[in-house]
């Protein structure tokens, strides 16, 4: 069974998938469609790297631009370095500026909804 066939079988169960499962899926050429991606738990999407999201979506990565103002894409963008977002070439904006240090302060994030940044 190839990645696409596997994805079709598990698609209806993915809404509650944890980050670890999404990371694993990203290695299997599943080409997740945007409608499915948008239904994923925000907390499961946030830890994914730009490279992992690109592999997870395949050619559907194109659709991130259309959804950049909507959750979970919006919140995910805020967590990525702008340099990394630029590798997608889609014009996604709002990432962490180059030269900033990201502090993983869980309590700070829980309160504000965004990561804590230290300027250059």
């Amino acid at each position: 069974m190839n990645g696409s066939e596997y994805f079709v079988k598990i698609q209806s169960f993915l809404g509650g998938a944890p980050t670890e499962d999404l990371k694993a899926l990203s290695q299997q050429n599943v080409s997740m469609d945007l409608a499915t991606f948008m239904k994923l738990r925000t907390d499961a999407v946030l830890p994914l790297t730009v490279a992992e999201v690109q592999k997870l979506l395949g050619p559907h990565v194109e659709g991130l631009k259309a959804e950049e103002r909507h959750r979970p894409v919006r919140d995910w963008i805020l967590r990525q370095r702008q340099d990394d977002l630029d590798t997608l070439g889609l014009g996604l904006q709002g990432g962490i500026p180059n030269g900033y240090l990201v502090l993983d302060l869980s309590m700070q994030e829980a309160l504000s909804g965004t990561p804590c940044l230290l300027g250059p």
Partner: antibody, heavy 114, light 107 residues
């Protein structure tokens, strides 16, 4: 001002090579793939390829892979299309296009003639 | 490669009429389709992207629809400035093929 600037015309001889330029301004050059599109006189649009200024990744239309080379210079926010072994079939308008399709250059008219 | 088939190749219509141009993809491209308008001697201009999202500054007389393999561009109440050539292009991977174009002329 957000724009893509291209020279108006290029005249070259058959068998020669040419490098067409496209200078981007007014937006983050590194954030978008740059595409190149060919249009022969009175004909439709033909996609040649695209290049990612950040990663250097390039995709080519197989038809042009052997004679077309895409490149970018991030310091001058300029994209380039080089065409080799030119024939009359290469006489066309060449457009550079930002990935989202919102922004097109004015096009360079390439004439291949002896 | 994904092939894009546009129809009709040419179309004559009068000011005030409504016209529809169609585009068919050789395989599923979901909603990754753009429509462009080109006037003689000018660069193409984006009208619609993601199959149905109107580009900034484009008249609401234009509307895109469809998904999968079948798409259409509808122009309501044609105006003199609408005449020109229209192209569809898929945005699902590469190569990003264009349709053959539809030339819209004044009757």
């Amino acid at each position: 001002q957000v724009q893509l600037q291209q020279p108006g015309t290029e005249l070259v001889k058959p068998g020669a090579s040419v490098r067409l330029s496209c200078r981007a301004s007014g937006y983050s050059f590194s954030s978008y793939w740059m595409h190149w599109v060919k249009q022969r006189p009175g004909q439709g649009l033909e996609w040649l390829g695209n290049i990612n200024p950040t990663t250097g990744d390039i995709n080519y239309n197989e038809k042009f892979r052997n004679r077309a080379t895409l490149a970018v210079d991030k310091s001058s926010t300029t994209a380039y299309l080089q065409l080799t072994s030119l024939t009359s079939e290469d006489s066309a308008v060449y457009f550079c296009v930002r990935h989202d399709g919102f922004l097109w250059g004015q096009g360079t008219t390439l004439t291949v003639s002896s | 490669d994904i092939q894009m088939t546009q129809s009709p190749a040419s179309l004559s219509a009068s000011v005030g009429e409504t016209v529809t141009i169609t585009c068919r993809a050789s395989e599923n491209i979901y909603s990754y389709l753009a429509w462009y308008q080109q006037k003689q001697g000018k660069s193409p201009q984006l009208l619609v992207y993601y199959a149905k999202t109107l580009a900034e500054g484009v008249s609401s007389r234009f509307s895109g629809s469809g998904s999968g393999t079948q798409f259409s561009l509808k122009i309501n109440s044609l105006q003199p400035e609408d005449f020109g050539t229209y192209y569809c292009q898929h945005q699902f991977g590469t190569p990003r093929t264009f349709g053959g174009g539809t030339k819209l002329e004044i009757r």
